[in-house]
């Protein structure tokens, strides 16, 4: 299944190499001089970078049920405080990633940083769980929200059949995969448009909300810090929900090698995005509270809908469309970024060789994109996705914390390393502690689910020894792997990146 990061297991040049004319050549073909290399291009500009980050952070949650924070704070004032604090802490994590991304100029995000600092085993475990469970399940969940909301205007007076939701979801997933397979530029352009839609939707909520405040609709802010059940013991859970809502700031680091002028673009994109998202989230919540009281917000499964029904009149009919577009943006951004994680992991020998190959004409990591399709479809038509993600939510913070701790380690181990962007040490230190705290909180608040998550994650250890370390694989297995790889190369028209040949 997986090779070690060396040349072919049978013979040198055991894979097919491409030429610039977009054909898989017979051996000995000479490449015409001055032609474009088959490799991923630096097409992610500052605007595209910002749209990737914002587009993947803002999903459907802020429109549907931003109640996890309020539920565990018990008061409007405290919930707004937590939203702000989580935004600042996420910015700290993002700044730490900005340093990592400009120091280690490779795509792959936390996988790459963990690999560089802590070695192959923890890095492999990370990508193993991401590929087999987290990413397919997460994509299926956000895609189901897309499916539900895109169909909603057509089923105003009756329930939407579950099968219809799943089928339209499957279409949505396929469109995202095709888009990301066909063109980096187009998926980035669409991401910019979808991010613009998201921000428009948020402004549509914020502006009337602020107008309500100006009109004196402040009843829900009176005694803002007194509320029912505002127990200090539940604040950590509120914090957990808040941090989860901001998760996604790390996605630009998955595509570092495709970022134009990464030393400048990555830190700038991260800072701009986090500022916009934090201000957007806090003001959206403020807007909600001008029209919906705390009890109603906790009850509702469609906060933006209730809000817009009351303040926007007929425009509320557009809310489901905006939510659907927001979900689609998250799907697109997530697939765009995470496919690069699989691409890099394959290049490092941690995933099948085919996943590190690039389409000869379109210059997209086609196999790394489409590998998600069947896995996501399996998730979509089976099992309890929410439970799966609950089991593994701790893993995200564990590995991100590990990556940021790696930054601190590198500061001491390699003090002379070139660091175009450098953050004060207290920032990664505080953020690493935050991640540690969140893993501990998972264990404390739900030891059963977290325990299952740990077990699932640890399946990566035997897998590592079986697929990566074990050299003496049977000859038939190696020959079959080669044949499958070559066949897929021909079908998909993909070759290894030229710099890596």
């Amino acid at each position: 299944m997986v090779r070690k990061p060396v040349v072919s297991t049978i013979s040198k040049g055991g894979y097919l190499q491409g030429n610039v004319n977009g054909r898989l050549p017979s051996l000995g073909n000479k490449e015409p001089p001055g032609q474009e290399k088959v490799q991923l291009k630096r097409k992610v500009t500052l605007l595209r970078g910002v749209s990737i980050i914002i587009g993947t952070i803002i999903g459907a949650g802020i429109f549907i049920s931003p109640k996890g924070v309020l539920q565990n704070t018990g008061s409007v004032g405290m919930s707004l405080t937590i939203w702000t604090v989580c935004g600042v802490l996420s910015l700290f994590g993002a700044l730490s990633y900005a340093e990592l991304g400009t120091t280690i100029k490779k795509s792959g995000g936390h996988y790459t940083y963990i690999l560089e600092v802590f070695g192959p085993l923890p890095a492999f475990v990370r990508v193993w769980v991401e590929l087999l469970i987290i990413r397919p399940a997460a994509t299926a969940v956000i895609s189901l929200a897309f499916g539900r909301y895109i169909l909603e205007p057509f089923f105003i007076q009756c329930e939407i059949p579950e099968l219809a939701i799943k089928l339209i979801t499957a279409v949505g997933i396929t469109v995202v995969m095709v888009l990301n397979s066909m063109s980096v530029s187009w998926s980035a352009r669409i991401q910019i448009f979808l991010t613009f839609c998201k921000l428009t939707a948020i402004l549509i909520i914020i502006v009337p909300g602020v107008m309500q405040l100006i009109k004196g609709q402040t009843q829900n802010f009176k005694d803002a810090f007194s509320g029912r059940d505002s127990s200090i013991t539940r604040l950590p859970l509120a914090f957990y929900y808040g941090m989860y809502a901001y998760a996604g700031w790390f996605y630009l680091n998955f595509v570092t090698e495709e970022v134009e002028n990464p030393e400048k673009t990555i830190p700038l994109a991260i800072c701009i995005s986090m500022a916009i998202v934090t201000i957007g989230y806090v003001l959206t919540n403020v807007a909600y509270f001008t029209t919906i009281n705390a009890e109603e917000l906790l009850l509702s499964n469609a906060v933006a809908v209730t809000f817009s029904e009351r303040l926007l009149g007929n425009f509320s009919l557009a809310v489901p469309i905006f939510v659907a577009l927001s979900c689609f943006g998250s799907m697109n951004g997530g697939v765009f970024a995470v496919s690069r994680l699989f691409y890099v992991a394959s290049r490092e020998g941690h995933l099948p060789e085919i996943l590190s190959m690039i389409h000869v004409r379109k210059h997209t990591p086609l196999p790394a994109v489409i590998v998600l399709h069947p896995l996501t479809m399996i998730m979509l038509f089976s099992g309890d996705l929410d439970s799966l993600l609950n089991f593994l939510s701790f893993a995200r913070w564990l590995f991100i914390g590990l990556a940021v701790a790696g930054l601190i380690y590198l500061r001491y181990k390699c003090p002379d390393m070139h660091r175009p962007f450098k953050v004060p040490l207290f920032i990664p230190a505080l953020f690493s502690f935050t991640c540690l705290f969140m893993v501990a909180l998972s264990l404390y608040s739900d030891p059963f689910s977290t325990g299952i998550g740990f077990v699932i994650t640890l399946t990566g250890v035997p897998a590592y020894y079986l697929f990566i370390i074990w050299d003496k694989k049977p000859r038939w297995f190696r020959i079959m792997s080669e044949k499958i790889t070559r066949t897929l190369q021909i079908i998909l028209e993909v070759v290894p990146e030229e710099d890596k040949l």
Partner: antibody, heavy 121, light 106 residues
């Protein structure tokens, strides 16, 4: 199809408490809020409050805070409303009701058959 | 809270007659919702978002209005329309119902 089955009529003494039930059939119980409405000849229909069985979130009409307590049991897909310190004013027909869809969270498409509560000594 | 005042409280109409039931809100609301209830039965959803008929509601029914003034109209009264009609708002918390208009057949 969607059905809301309410418990039978109750005759209770003043000062006592009563727990009315509403069993949900034909849909995923945890996906929708369950609301409770009181009906009397004098006051007509009055919204008491609601519970979201999925999250456990509740909302009450200020008038009924302290009087009604809403709970839900996911395992049996049943919503409950407990009324305490009963007086003759609490004699009424009580309905559980469910919104059609999230877009109209307070537009009630499905109603139980109603439970008649009589408070009398 | 927003108070909804329905008028008239009781009215009777002959078959074929046009009927209008009014609902006035104590402050402006975005939409009005209407329910029909017959004796011994639970209320039924009748009109949503001011003017949209719920499924199964005959086309002779219509709803209109904005701000604080809303109405339900039956273009041609039929025997089966005899019932009590309630208006409802959820523009402001808590949601409230009107006291009802009892429509009888003459």
């Amino acid at each position: 199809q969607v059905q809301l089955q309410q418990s039978g009529a109750e005759l209770v003494r003043p000062g006592a408490s009563v727990k009315l039930s509403c069993k949900a059939l034909g849909y995923t119980f945890t996906d929708y809020e369950m609301h409770w409405v009181k009906q009397t000849p004098v006051h007509g229909l009055e919204w008491i409050g609601a519970i979201h069985p999925g999250s456990g979130g509740t909302a009450y009409n200020q008038k009924f805070k302290g009087k009604a307590t809403l709970t839900a049991d996911k395992s049996s897909s049943t919503a409950y409303m407990e009324l305490s310190s009963l007086t003759s004013e609490d004699s009424a027909v009580y309905y559980c009701t469910r919104p059609l869809y999230y877009r109209y969270p307070y537009y009630f498409d499905y109603w139980g058959q109603g439970t008649t509560l009589t408070v009398s000594s | 809270q927003i108070v909804l005042t329905q008028s008239p409280a009781i009215m009777s109409a002959s078959p074929g007659e046009k009927v209008t039931i009014s609902c006035s809100a104590s402050s402006s609301v975005s939409y009005m919702y209407w329910y029909q209830q017959k004796p011994g039965s639970s209320p039924k959803p009748w009109i949503y978002r001011t003017s949209n008929l719920a499924s199964g509601v005959p086309a002779r029914f219509s709803g209109s209005g904005s701000g604080t003034s809303y109405s339900l109209t039956i273009s041609s009264m039929e025997a089966e329309d005899a019932a009590t009609y309630y208006c409802q708002q959820y523009h402001s918390y808590p949601l409230t119902f009107g006291a009802g208009t009892k429509l009888e057949l003459k």
